[in-house]
Interface confidence: low
């Protein structure tokens, strides 16, 4: 679909409001350190230019690609070299290399201050004074901290953010109305960012084929009544949408996502019976709803898979004729029958099937060779089932905080070279799998747990990639996307690790801990726990538990003291000495 002016085409398709929001997100995701005002100025300039192109598509520069237009605009930033260092070298390149260069400089862990939420009255005043600027700041702050956030979905979050302020700033108790909504948006936003980060990593590190395989499996579970042609069409379109968003082509991505939602709703009769409610919603809500829709019921009387994929004499012929299509059909047929399996497990089964066919179709008697291929699936299915069973039992026994601590110890022993903040963040998120998934019945536990763990372990992988410190992490992250979790699960204590020198400063605490929220206090304690394990990797669970219990009692005691700071100083020294003795440091 060739257009004389791409920028005019997207402006007309998306409308001015969405166009401006998406350009702001794109710029903030590229130049994460730039001040808000600078970005707004750039966005306004691009918007004015787009309007001239809408008026006359033949006007000067209107025929340029969006990458060229946006890249040229970003490269006008005066402080590029001093703020971003070598990223400024991108501006010497031509498209498409320049855009690739900007993408490579996206920072998953930018050095930005923590967002501190102002008082509710302050926020409501700001909202009423200038609603447009207030909402733009939200987009800007989220986008720069999450450079791979799914842009059309961020528009949906912004819409909910606006709705929360519109409703709650008029309420009798503003805080009671607003704060739970903002907490929910924050938590959902972090989860959404992490899920999208995995999609982008899948595309960028493992290629389109890996993403398509994931999509075939997931969509086949979700839409088991849809025929393979339909699932394949959706996979092709979804891959295009995510390739665009992960590549910084946010206008195209949002436009294509809207088209995909439209197609799905127009064809819901041949896709899923669960789409009716979603399809009655406005665009942003509709797209979000479709992405989260529950699995449709499986068609009755699906025949055995063995007939087409094991017993048939044509297996090798069909495989040779169109390998990826045949494997895609296998994945589709297996996934639609197994909503109880995780997507990564389904992909492991498909990989095993592919490996078997590659070997057997070259053998003297192929059928004899692959006849028992389904038997090879049994241990692959049982491994995550057993792991989830054990960990859910541990979670139910310990509760979330202590379960997180058990994982902190486990993962610090596996990969002690990883930075303490990363270990704390990742282990806390791994620990959330308990409350998120263990409540589910057996049939829903595995897809919930293992696919969530894939998202969390990807966080570890992208953070580690920025500053690699552990060969074991690199190996698990890069060898196989679908085997990341089994790879990390299989890691034992790193015997090569040289324990960290003891530093009393690491275990010195002050009265400010008393004013922290429960969550922040937990993080402080968990940070200390990781440091303890790094000092004493051979410490037993019992030793660590004793020290942590003493630590909790020390914090509680000093927070109740009249002279808190003196208590922390004096009791802290005693605690450090006692801990050193208990751990033999």
């Amino acid at each position: 679909d060739a257009h004389k002016s791409e920028v005019a085409h997207r402006f007309k398709d998306l409308g001015e409001e969405n166009f401006k929001a998406l350009v702001l997100i794109a710029f903030a995701q590229y130049l994460q350190q730039c001040p808000f005002e600078d970005h707004v100025k750039l966005v306004n300039e691009v918007t004015e230019f787009a309007k001239t192109c809408v008026a006359d598509e033949s006007a000067e520069n209107c025929d340029k690609s969006l990458h060229t237009l946006f890249g040229d605009k970003l490269c006008t930033v005066a402080t590029l070299r001093e703020t971003y260092g070598e990223m400024a070298d991108c501006c010497a390149k031509q498209e498409p290399e320049r855009n690739e260069c900007f993408l490579q400089h996206k920072d998953d862990n930018p050095n930005l201050p923590r967002l501190v939420r102002p008082e509710v009255d302050v926020m409501c005043t700001a909202f009423h004074d200038n609603e447009e600027t207030f909402l733009k700041k939200y987009l800007y702050e989220i986008a720069r901290r999450h450079p791979y956030f799914y842009a059309p979905e961020l528009l949906f979050f912004a819409k909910r953010y606006k709705a929360a302020f519109t409703e709650c700033c008029q309420a009798a108790d503003k805080a009671a109305c607003l704060l739970p909504k903002l907490d929910e948006l924050r938590d959902e936003g972090k989860a959404s960012s992490a899920k999208q980060r995995l999609k982008c990593a899948s595309l960028q590190k493992f290629g389109e084929r890996a993403f398509k395989a994931w999509a075939v499996a997931r969509l086949s579970q979700r839409f088991p009544k849809a025929e393979f042609a339909e699932v394949s069409k959706l996979v092709t379109d979804l891959t295009k949408v995510h390739t665009e968003c992960c590549h910084g082509d946010l206008l195209e991505c949002a436009d294509d996502r809207a088209d995909l939602a439209k197609y799905i709703c127009e064809n819901q009769d041949s896709i899923s019976s669960k789409l009716k409610e979603c399809c009655e919603k406005p665009l942003l809500e509709k797209s979000h709803c479709i992405a989260e829709v529950e699995n449709d019921e499986m068609p009755a009387d699906l025949p055995s898979l063995a007939a087409d994929f094991v017993e048939s004499k044509d297996v090798c012929k069909n495989y040779a004729e169109a390998k990826d299509v045949f494997l895609g059909m296998f994945l589709y047929e297996y996934a639609r029958r197994h909503p109880d399996y995780s997507v990564v497990l389904l992909l492991r089964l498909a990989k095993t099937y592919e490996t078997t066919l590659e070997k057997c179709c070259a053998a003297a008697d192929p059928h004899e060779c692959y006849a028992k291929v389904f038997d090879e699936f049994k241990p692959l299915v049982e491994e995550p089932q057993n792991l989830i069973k054990q960990n859910c039992e541990l979670f139910e026994q310990l509760g979330e905080y202590k379960f997180q601590n058990a994982l902190l110890v486990r993962y610090t022993k596996k990969v002690p070279q990883v930075s303490t903040p990363t270990l704390v963040e990742v282990s806390r998120n791994l620990g959330k799998v308990g409350s998120k998934c263990c409540k589910h019945p057996e049939a829903k536990r595995m897809p919930c747990a293992e696919d969530y763990l894939s998202v969390v372990l990807n966080q570890l992988c992208v953070l580690h990639e920025k500053t690699p410190v552990s060969d074991r992490v690199t190996k698990c992250c890069t060898e196989s996307l679908v085997n990341r979790r089994p790879c990390f699960s299989a890691l034992e204590v790193d015997e090569t690790y040289v324990p960290k020198e003891f530093n009393a400063e690491t275990f010195t605490f002050h009265a400010d801990i008393c004013t922290l929220s429960e969550k922040e206090r937990q993080i402080k304690k968990q940070t200390a726990l990781v440091e303890l394990v790094k000092h004493k990797p051979k410490a037993t669970k019992e030793q660590l538990k004793a020290v942590m219990d003493d630590f909790a009692a020390f914090v509680e005691k000093c927070c109740k003291a009249d002279d808190k700071e003196t208590c922390f100083a004096e009791e802290g020294k005693k605690l450090v000495a006692a801990s050193q003795a208990a751990l033999g440091l």
Partner: nanobody, 124 residues
Framework: EVQLVESGGGVVQPGGSLRLSCAAS????????MGWFRQAPGKEREFVSA????????YYADSVKGRFTISRDNSKNTVYLQMNSLRPEDTALYYC?????????????????WGQGTLVTVSS
């Protein structure tokens, strides 16, 4: 390697009907999206119609909607194009095509296998 053989072409008067058939061999017919394309003398090849593996979806070019019907019989490895209310501008060489990529495609470059074509002439 899939072989496609078209039949059923011929000369017909405006307003008349024809039924084209395309027999496939050498591949697993039920795994392919099947399509019909046509090429008039001195013109580019253009999409006419396509049908999904299990016949759930059918696609038509705007110029033939309501007049042409595509169908398939997987047990016979055959795809059909029923053409009614034929017009002189329908005169062309009609090709049957098979796509192993199972998304919807109206572009000829997405199809992997092609027949030799069958000639349809609409003339009084």
């Amino acid at each position: 390697e899939v072989q496609l053989v078209e039949s059923g072409g011929g000369v017909v008067q405006p307003g008349g009907s024809l039924r084209l058939s395309c027999a496939a061999s050498g591949g697993t017919f039920s795994t392919y999206v099947m399509g019909w394309f046509r090429q008039a003398p001195g013109k580019e090849r253009e999409f006419v119609s396509a049908i999904s593996q299990n016949s759930i979806h059918t696609y038509y070019a705007d110029s033939v909607k309501g007049r042409f019907t595509i169908s398939r019989d997987n047990s016979k490895n055959t795809v059909y194009l029923q053409m009614n209310s034929l017009r002189p501008e329908d005169t062309a060489l009609y090709y049957c095509a098979a796509s192993r990529f199972t998304s919807w495609y109206t572009a000829d470059y997405e199809y992997d296998y092609w027949g030799q074509g069958t000639l349809v002439t609409v003339s009084s």
